[in-house]
């Protein structure tokens, strides 16, 4: 058997001595007949240890026993052990008794074999077994006096090699994790949740984290369980970012050619039908009317221009009716309405003019009179020594209903180069400079523009009693919407409940998956802020997209181009959205085009304005933005201006 | 461009006649009245009248009823102002403008001084 | 006849001040007043128009307000050149008639 290093020398060095072992024997025999029988010498001392070492220790040693005990001669019992045990310098024993194994006698002098574990001279020292390889243990070295052992760390446990430790499987334990997902790890485990979730130790349940908390969102945050939305505000022009926390404005992807002349008038400007330009004539000299302009539209009504004094007097309205000119006139009270020539709402200059003659009044399309009535007066009228006229563009001066045949009074169009009286007109041409929202697009095509600014709104039923029904009322929203759009995010159609502030529903084009949290280009129908339906759209090709959403009673679909959309609810949830609609529904709702009033964020999927070309069909009828209830007054109701040619 | 140009200054004695022009061009002569305007020296304005340049017909204020003839020559887009008989409170500058109900366009005014 | 009480005839003024003239009318006229500047040896130049609308090509200083029988020309922060005389006229009846000016002096 082989011992460690340090217990074979504590072995060796004694063993050196043994040799000796009868020498010993015989040297105690000799002490006893010189020094024990008879009073001895350091000479004779000398001669019986044959050494000095063991002299020097012994005779002063032997004077204290001669002193203690009187000489040998005294024959005291206590002399001869006193003295017998001078030289065993085991006795009494020096060495630990704890630790020592044997005590060994030298030549004046002592060696104590140390039991395993204890070390030092006297052996009353512990030896770290743990300080060397860590005693051998795998994990933990626990030393102790005289000894050591192994232990592992939590979540293992020591072989029965007393050395090596074993991970404990906690997962065994079906309690471990409660509801949660357990994973064991090497000496643990762990209590796993879906991602937005934390695992609650004392509940030992996983527990929905409140991200919005943590303050992630940059505007407006939505805890949901396991996940949360942040929302930005889209009626203030911004979107979410890429990194679906942060806002960022939302950038027209399309360049559309806004450019305006500045030498033209805008007549669609005021939503409230009033004039854009209100002229006042007045005159000493009897003069007649004279008007002439260059005139472009594509919107087949509304009033180009009324001369004349107030509403009970004497005037003439020049208007579009079904795209062709008509000309409403009163004379000292008599109304009289006279409609002739082409259609001219094709969105092309032509010049139109107004003269009064002697007794008629003759109105010129490019030169060639449509239009020549016989009148008996004058539409200059003599007030205090002055004649006077009043002149507005784009509207007249009193109410539609006053006309003699009421007319939607607001009209999408275009003038330049006009002429009143013949006179050079130097106020309109200054202010109109220096106010783009008085002028017109350079280049116009059909349909409607939303510049992204604001919406406008009607109020439409959308219950319908069918007459083989009797009293049950049926419901359906369809919409077709063509769109060229210039922006990534927006509302195209919306109805909004005034009463309960909410968003019943919403067709929008939005530039990520709000559950996915991914950036994509997409449709969403809404029902309040779930979305039903997703389809997918290549929003900035500068192309015209046909969005078709058709929502009855049990369905709800969406179409982008033909192609249907992806549903996002189960047939459950389906018709539980529907069910919410249809409450709407029955309440008052306003319809919305291009946006959403000034709701919370969270109401729908978007709130943004929506920014391009659209022209609306609500259940098989064109929405015309001049008859809304209200439009903003830079969406321009029939016209829209070309996506800008790409640079060569 | 609309402009009315006036003839040049005139000394006159008391009791002599003085006929003042005013060429109007940029415009159809016929289609505004021709307003006559006086302003004493250190004095403010004063509206004297106007000429209707369709019929020639003339209307004068009553301060100016007698002595003072407003008439035209439309062959030459031209409205004329005489003063008959002078004085020396006719001693003023006169100005020619074209009738908007108001007055946008002036001649650079004549003065005529009557002095003995 | 429509008579015109133009106040005051004259007043000082440093370039900066805020001047205002007023004129006062014998009856109610709308809002038919117009106003002229005129410096020495010029013919007047038209300010406002009716319906106190400010006229092309004169700086936004100068501003009409009133109706009725009270009106006032305001300039705002006045300039060198503004020093001149002014005038008021009304355009309401036959015969039109002018007030009696007021000189705006250097102070």
């Known amino acids: 058997a082989l011992l460690p290093a340090r217990e074979a020398t504590q072995f060796l060095r004694p063993r050196q001595r043994r040799a000796f072992q009868v020498f010993e024997e015989a040297k105690q025999g000799h002490l006893e007949r010189e020094c024990v029988e008879e009073l001895c010498s350091r000479e004779e001392a000398r001669e019986v240890f044959e050494n000095d070492p063991e002299t020097d220790y012994f005779y002063p040693r032997y004077l204290d026993c001669i002193n203690k005990y009187g000489s040998p001669y005294t024959k005291n019992s206590g002399f001869a052990t006193c003295v017998q045990n001078l030289p065993d310098q085991c006795t009494p024993n020096p060495c630990d008794r704890k630790g020592t194994q044997a005590c060994q006698d030298l030549m004046g002098n002592f060696f104590c074999l140390c039991k395993a574990g204890w070390g030092g001279r006297l052996c009353d020292k512990d030896v770290n077994e743990c300080s060397q390889e860590n005693g051998g243990c795998l994990q933990i070295c626990h030393n102790k006096p005289g000894s050591f052992h192994c232990s592992c760390h939590s979540g293992f446990e020591l072989s029965s090699d007393g050395r090596t430790c074993q991970d404990i499987d906690e997962c065994a334990d079906s309690e471990a994790c409660g509801e949660a997902r357990c994973k064991n790890l090497p000496g643990s485990y762990s209590c796993l949740c879906d991602e937005g979730f934390a695992y609650s130790s004392q509940e030992k349940a996983c527990r929905d984290v409140d991200e919005c908390l943590q303050g992630r969102c940059e505007q407006v945050c939505v805890n949901s369980p396991g996940s949360y939305t942040c929302h930005c505000d889209g009626r203030g022009g911004l979107k979410l970012s890429q990194d679906m926390d942060t806002c960022e404005d939302i950038l027209p992807c399309v360049p559309f050619s806004v450019a305006k002349s500045v030498k033209s008038l805008y007549l669609g400007r005021m939503f409230s039908g009033t004039p854009v330009i209100r002229l006042r004539f007045k005159r000493l000299q009897p003069t007649r009317l004279v008007a002439e302009f260059d005139f472009r539209t594509f919107d087949p009504e509304g009033i180009l221009l009324f001369a004349g004094g107030h509403q009970d007097s004497t005037w003439i309205v020049l208007a579009l009716r079904a795209g062709r000119l008509e000309l409403q006139l009163r004379y000292n009270g008599v109304g009289r309405v006279t409609s002739s020539g082409p259609v001219i709402n094709h969105g092309m200059w032509q010049t139109i003019s107004v003269e009064e003659l002697a007794r008629n009044l003759v109105i010129k399309v490019n030169r060639d009179a449509v239009m020549k009535i016989a009148v008996a007066g004058d539409l200059f009228q003599p007030e205090r020594g002055l004649y006077h006229l009043n002149l507005t563009v784009g509207g007249i001066p009193f109410h539609e209903k006053d006309l003699v045949q009421p007319i939607n009074p607001r009209l999408d169009g275009c003038m330049r180069s006009w002429n009143w009286l013949n006179g050079e007109d130097t106020t309109i041409q200054e202010t109109v400079k220096v106010n783009t929202r008085m002028q017109c697009f350079s280049v116009t095509e059909r349909g409607s523009f939303y510049p992204g600014s604001g919406f406008a709104f009607y109020s439409l039923d959308y219950m319908r009693t069918p007459l083989d029904v009797g009293t049950e009322s049926t419901w359906e929203v369809e919409v077709v919407a063509h769109i060229r759009p210039a922006a990534d995010t927006g509302v195209l159609f919306a109805l909004w409940a005034p009463d309960l502030r909410a968003v019943p529903l919403s067709v929008a084009l939005v530039d990520y998956h709000s559950t996915k949290k991914l950036k994509k280009q997409l449709v969403v129908l809404a029902v309040e802020h779930t979305a039903l339906a997703l389809m997918e759209i290549k929003v900035c090709d500068g192309q015209e997209h046909v969005v078709t959403v058709s929502l009855r009673d049990g369905e709800a679909t969406l179409e982008v181009d033909g192609t249907r959309g992806q549903s996002e609810v189960s047939a459950a949830q389906l018709q539980e959205r529907l069910a919410v609609l249809e409450r709407h529904l029955r309440s008052p709702v306003l319809t919305f085009a291009g946006g959403l009033p000034d709701v919370p964020v969270t109401s729908a999927p978007v709130t943004a304005f929506y920014r391009g070309c659209m022209t609306l069909e609500v259940n098989r009828r064109l929405l015309d933005l001049d008859e809304a209830a209200y439009k903003h007054s830079d969406i321009t109701a029939h016209s829209c201006p070309p996506v800008e040619p790409a640079a060569a | 461009q609309v402009h009315l140009v006036q003839s040049g200054s005139e000394l006159k004695k008391p009791g002599a006649s003085v006929k003042i022009s005013c060429k109007a061009s940029?415009?159809?002569?016929?289609?505004?009245?021709m307003n006559w305007v006086r302003q004493a020296p250190g004095q403010g304005l004063e509206w004297m009248g106007w000429?209707?340049?369709?019929?020639?017909?003339?209307t004068y204020t009553e301060e100016f009823k007698g002595r003072f003839v407003f008439s035209l020559d439309t062959s030459v887009t031209t409205s004329y102002l005489q003063i008959s008989t002078l004085k020396a409170e006719d001693t003023a500058v006169y100005f020619c403008?074209?009738?908007?109900?108001?007055?946008?366009?002036w001649g650079q005014g004549t003065l005529v001084t009557v002095s003995s | 006849e429509t008579t015109l009480t133009q106040s005051p005839s004259s007043l000082s003024a440093s370039t900066g001040d805020r001047v205002t003239i007023t004129c006062i009318t014998s009856?109610?006229?709308?809002?038919?007043m117009n106003w002229y500047q005129q410096k020495p040896g010029k013919a007047p130049k038209l300010l406002i128009s009716?319906?106190?609308t400010l006229r092309p090509g004169v700086p936004s200083r100068f501003s009409g307000s009133g109706s009725g029988t009270d009106f006032t020309l305001t300039i705002s922060s006045t300039q060198p050149e503004d020093f001149a005389d002014y005038y008021c006229?009304?355009?309401?009846?036959?015969?039109?008639?002018f007030g009696q000016g007021t000189k705006v002096e250097i102070k």
């Open positions: 403008a074209r009738d908007e109900g108001w007055f946008v366009y």
């Open positions: 940029g415009y159809t002569f016929t289609n505004y009245g």
């Open positions: 000429i209707n340049t369709n019929t020639g017909e003339p």
């Open positions: 009856t109610d006229i709308d809002d038919d």
């Open positions: 009716e319906g106190n």
């Open positions: 006229l009304q355009t309401d009846s036959v015969p039109l008639t």
